[in-house]
């Protein structure tokens, strides 16, 4: 399971696509900035084992995939870029799932991470709530796009965990 290299390559491609997806100038959206509280302190203060890192990364990518697979998202972004971005995320999910099976075994599920997974879910709930409150405005989506890019690059400790032998 050569995850570190493939994941980092796919991650970079996803970030490039996300960067290209902007439709309006973010300069007009300063007043829409919002504190989503990505749980970076929890992540930074923890040494993730490989299986833990895989399951938390899987949750982050799954939640991002869900967020960008909604009808509201389809209306907000250029369709071909959105499709490429979603495909990239879907392939990352497949890579991670294949790794989980290889690392843990088919039957076993890494449940030692429930707190981290819950933190990720709550974070995405805050993002979804913000979009709803802002009525899925173009600026709200711009702010969310910037936030997702930031959270993707914040998950360095998780990526370190991918390189660790359990």
């Amino acid at each position: 399971c050569d995850l570190p290299q493939t994941h980092s390559l796919r991650n970079r491609r996803a970030l490039i696509l996300l960067a290209q997806m902007g439709r309006i100038s973010p300069f007009s959206c300063l007043k829409d900035r919002h504190e989503f509280r990505f749980p970076e302190e929890e992540f930074d203060g923890h040494q993730f084992q490989k299986t833990q890192a895989i399951s938390v990364l899987h949750e982050m990518i799954q939640q991002t995939f869900n967020l960008f697979s909604t009808e509201d998202s389809s209306a907000a972004w250029e369709q071909s870029l959105l499709e490429k971005f979603s495909t990239e995320l879907y392939q990352q999910l497949n890579d991670l799932e294949a790794c989980v099976i290889q690392e843990v075994g088919v039957e076993e599920t890494p449940l030692m991470n429930e707190d981290f997974i819950l933190a990720v879910r709550k974070y995405f709930q805050r993002i979804t709530l913000y979009l709803m409150e802002k009525k899925y405005s173009p600026c709200a989506w711009e702010v969310v796009r910037a936030e997702i890019m930031r959270s993707f690059s914040f998950s360095t400790n998780l990526k370190k965990g991918l390189r660790r032998k359990d």
Epitope: L30, R33, F36
Partner: antibody, heavy 121, light 107 residues
Framework: EVQLVQSGAEVKKPGESLKISCKGS????????IGWVRQMPGKGLEWMGI????????AYSPSFQGQVTISADKSISTAYLQWSSLKASDTAMYYC??????????????WGQGTLVTVSS | DIQMTQSPSSLSASVGDRVTITCRAS??????LNWYQQKPGKAPKLLIY???SLQSGVPSRFSGSGSGTDFTLTISSLQPEDFATYYC?????????FGQGTKVEIK
Amino acid sequence: EVQLVQSGAEVKKPGESLKISCKGSGYSFTSYWIGWVRQMPGKGLEWMGIIDPSDSDTAYSPSFQGQVTISADKSISTAYLQWSSLKASDTAMYYCARHPGLNWAPDFDYWGQGTLVTVSS
Amino acid sequence: DIQMTQSPSSLSASVGDRVTITCRASQSIAEFLNWYQQKPGKAPKLLIYFASSLQSGVPSRFSGSGSGTDFTLTISSLQPEDFATYYCQQSIDFPLTFGQGTKVEIK
């Protein structure tokens, strides 16, 4: 360590052109915007404009629109401020500073050391 | 453009004094306000962002408060290194604008 390093002091004559630089290091250059701020001798801070190095999108203060050009070369993590025809009133210290864009993070948390531009005949 | 007005424009104080600087915006800026400190010949340094968040590495004697149009920077016990010029800046919309500055001098 995050650093913004600006080019050295310049002495120019009125009518001459000039391009000063601001090189970022220790962070992802395209993840932050770069703003430019002017401080005339003995005066306060004036925001001139800003650039998103990821796509070179720019915004200017109306006071500086058409007077200066802000650009960036992301391949070398450098932002620029340029004049095509300097005036004596352009004499000032010019600072670049890092801005988090739309992220909820401190504005202008790191600054360059400043570039002193003197325009005199 | 949003106008930012600081008061006073200068003040004299002694080491140990409690110092308060105010900043008023010409329209509501929610909590999108930053405070900077600048010493002669140096670049400005961020002290407070989003009206009340203390920037990493800044001593806890500095604090910020306010929202809407009225904001305050407080130095609870002035230290020798705090003699400088302080600027507020709104960050809710372009063009970004600074206050004219408040110079804190030794009494």
